[in-house]
């Protein structure tokens, strides 16, 4: 058993049929010695008396808010949560496996630039009685500070019969140099509590590996005289690291109709303009990627050919 | 401690081409190592990230773009003194700061060159003959060093009398390639910045 926060404790249980469970001793936070009784949750049934209460925690029915009283007055609470371990593996029931970029990916993180700011998000089908708390650091043995905000519900989607909820959090490394060469990864730890179930999820990454620029901005077309070709130009996104001559991007320019199966014109360039063939009912799209370290491509920025 | 903005004449920067070749060569070599050594811990997640130039050179700091010198987090100075007679710029405007930056890059390359050559000598003794260093990568390191054109004492190639542990050597190769790729990215960024300045 360990303390998650003040008066909240996590009991780690091997979860299998007829498991013996864990013996837990609760101590009432009071100078009083006599006349103390214990109850669980909203029940008025007295579980025991005395300054300490010993319980055998085997299942969720044994978890919950234990309260010690004296003469109708509440003295203190202890909330017990369960963390299940099945076949030596901690449960991951609360969050959905996003399976990208690989299986067992529960947390996904992205950074728009090298400033040390990043966003992580996760998915769940649970809508109520759910809380998250996020901690982060650079390295684990001698951790350097990363400050994370509160996790917030950022999107709701309907997937078949189920509703899916996306939560996200923003974090900022306390003293980040955009030009630094990372040797210790960022560690992100998410504590998830659903009712009386506790789970924790972690992700470890270098900022350089989670870079995904914003789409290029200010796409403009200029038809070329006596030609089917148009010159398309754009600018670096505002959120990208500066100077741009140091933090350079490379671009993919594509002309395609509405369907992905349609024929297309595609060209790659390090410049902020390119010449392509425009077709009726097609769109010109441009996306960006770090020129020197190939992490993710940005989303597309598009303009219609006409 | 940083790069001044008004430096080389545009298009007068032969090192840019060599640094692009360097990044390409080390990326190819790393990809080859990851494929060939698929049963060894050779991915970014599996290896320890070591920097053989740590406390010996200060490339990131010495080559910091002017715009980032206002960022206090970028200025944890590790001053190192370097020889300053580089000729990469083909321009007389080479400032002291730029020479410091370019000589730091030169020292990085020299250190990695020695490590890679020592390692290759060991890998050539491996009866499995599983992996060797790409000669193209070694040649590209050499070309960039020549383009930087700094005079400094040659570092003797480390020779070891004991029987090499090929497993450890291959793990070390992965560590070295990952670190060198990161440094090659920095070098490419620096050269691109200088070329644009």
């Amino acid at each position: 058993i360990w303390e998650l926060k003040k008066d909240v404790y996590v009991v780690e249980l091997d979860w299998y049929p007829d498991a013996p469970g864990e013996m837990v001793v609760l101590t009432c936070d009071t100078p009083e010695e006599d006349g103390i009784t214990w109850t669980l949750d909203q029940s008025s049934e007295v579980l025991g008396s005395g300054k300490t209460l010993t319980i055998q925690v085997k299942e969720f029915g044994d978890a919950g808010q234990y309260t010690c009283h004296k003469g109708g007055e509440v003295l203190s609470h202890s909330l017990l949560l369960l963390h299940k371990k099945e076949d030596g593996i901690w449960s991951t029931d609360i969050l959905k496996d996003q399976k990208e970029p690989k299986n067992k990916t529960f947390l996904r993180c992205e950074a728009k630039n090298y400033s040390g700011r990043f966003t992580c998000w996760w998915l769940t089908t649970i809508s109520t009685d759910l809380t998250f708390s996020v901690k982060s650091s650079r390295g684990s043995s001698d951790p350097q500070g990363v400050t994370c905000g509160a996790a917030t519900l950022s999107a709701e989607r309907v997937r078949g019969d189920n509703k899916e909820y996306e939560y996200s959090v923003e974090c900022q490394e306390d003293s980040a140099c955009p030009a630094a060469e990372e040797s210790l990864p960022i560690e992100v730890m998410v504590d998830a509590v659903h009712k009386l179930k506790y789970e924790n999820y972690t992700s470890s990454f270098f900022i350089r590996d989670i870079i995904k620029p914003d789409p290029p901005k200010n796409l403009q077309l200029k038809p070329l005289k006596n030609s089917r070709q148009v010159e398309v130009s754009w600018e670096y996104p505002d959120t990208w690291s500066t100077p741009h001559s140091y933090f350079s991007l490379t671009f993919c320019v594509q002309v395609q109709g509405k369907s992905k199966r349609e024929k297309k014109d595609r060209v790659f360039t390090d410049k902020t303009s390119a010449t392509v063939i425009c077709r009726k009912n097609a769109s010109i799209s441009v996306r960006a990627q770090d020129r020197y370290y190939s992490s993710s491509w940005s989303e597309w920025a598009s303009v219609p050919c006409s | 401690r940083n790069l001044p903005v008004a430096t080389p004449d545009p298009g007068m920067f032969p090192c840019l081409h060599h640094s692009q070749n360097l990044l390409r060569a080390v990326s190819n070599m790393l990809q080859k190592a990851r494929q060939t050594l698929e049963f060894y811990p050779c991915t970014s997640e599996e290896i320890d990230h070591e920097d053989i130039t740590k406390d010996k050179t200060s490339t990131v700091e010495a080559c910091l773009p002017l715009e980032l010198t206002k960022n206090e987090s970028c200025l944890n100075s590790r001053e190192t003194s370097f020889i300053t007679n580089g000729s990469c710029l083909a321009s007389r405007k080479t400032s002291f700061m730029m020479a410091l930056c370019l000589s730091s890059i030169y020292e990085d390359l020299k250190m990695y060159q020695v490590e890679f050559k020592t390692m290759n000598a060991k890998l050539l003794m491996d009866p499995k003959r599983q992996i060797f260093l790409d000669q193209n990568m070694l040649a590209v390191i050499d070309e960039l060093m020549q383009a930087l054109n700094f005079n400094s004492e040659t570092v003797p190639q480390k020779s070891s009398l004991e029987e090499p542990d090929f497993y450890k050597t291959k793990i070390k190769l992965c560590i070295l390639l990952h670190a060198f790729r990161i440094r090659a990215v920095t070098i490419d960024r620096v050269m691109s910045y200088l070329n644009a300045s």
């Epitope: 024929k263 360039t269 390090d270 | -």
Partner: antibody, heavy 118, light 107 residues
Framework: QVQLVQSGAEVKKPGASVKVSCKAS????????LHWVRQAPGQGLEWMGW????????EYAPKFQGRVTMTTDTSTSTAYMELRSLRSDDTAVYYC???????????WGQGTMVTVSS | EIVMTQSPATLSVSPGERATLSCRAP??????LHWYQQKPGQAPRLLIY???QSISGIPARFSGSGSGTEFTLTISSLQSEDFAVYYC?????????FGGGTKVEIK
């Protein structure tokens, strides 16, 4: 699967014209761009131009501008390349090729040998 | 127009050996570079597109790399059926142009 079958070999006199055909099967002609590339005996490859069968748009290499016409007949799934004012150095194998991407060549015809000789 | 240069013109390699073919552009063409194989009496065949992208059905021993001005086609272990002429082609701008080719012959 996608296939391109070209017309047979031709022998032409200098100053004449030649029209090579290229019949597409296994796909809808308008779904792909169509290019023509030629290869003189023992020489390399030379791009001549492309046509978009969907709308008849064409782009020709400057070298062939004014001397080449590329057309398509969607009813027969056939593309044509006509080269006029033939010279002896036009002697080559002419290939048609198709791709969903405009700038490289995925599916090739078997080639048509055109000999220009007096 | 962009004139592509391939080297060497002829490469003599023993079966089982590695072959490295080079293609150069006079200016940066990013990764707008494609590789073809042509055997005598046959039409060319696309091997690699956009410098390094492999094509299904093409053996894994063929790989491409490079960007900017220098590109490489590598055949990791030459098989008898790989002896042919190899062409690079740029798609950075029109007119599309090919390199002069590299003939890979048996040593």
């Amino acid at each position: 699967q996608v296939q391109l079958v070209q017309s047979g070999a031709e022998v032409k006199k200098p100053g004449a014209s030649v029209k090579v055909s290229c019949k597409a099967s296994g796909y809808t002609l308008t779904d792909y761009y169509l290019h023509w590339v030629r290869q003189a005996p023992g020489q390399g490859l030379e791009w001549m131009g492309w046509i978009d069968p969907e709308n008849g748009d064409t782009e020709y290499a400057p070298k062939f501008q004014g001397r080449v016409t590329m057309t398509t007949d969607t009813s027969t799934s056939t593309a044509y390349m006509e080269l006029r004012s033939l010279r002896s150095d036009d002697t080559a194998v002419y290939y048609c090729n198709a791709n969903k991407e405009l700038r490289y060549f995925d599916v090739w015809g078997q080639g048509t040998m055109v000999t220009v000789s007096s | 127009e962009i004139v592509m240069t391939q080297s060497p013109a002829t490469l003599s390699v023993s079966p089982g050996e590695r072959a490295t073919l080079s293609c150069r552009a006079p200016q940066s063409i990013s990764i707008n570079l494609h590789w073809y194989q042509q055997k005598p009496g046959q039409a060319p065949r696309l091997l690699i597109y956009f410098a390094s992208q492999s094509i299904s059905g093409i053996p894994a021993r063929f790989s491409g790399s490079g960007s900017g001005t220098e590109f490489t086609l590598t055949i990791s272990s030459l098989q008898s059926e790989d002896f042919a002429v190899y062409y690079c082609q740029q798609s950075n701008s029109f007119p599309l142009t090919f390199g002069g080719g590299t003939k890979v012959e048996i040593k």
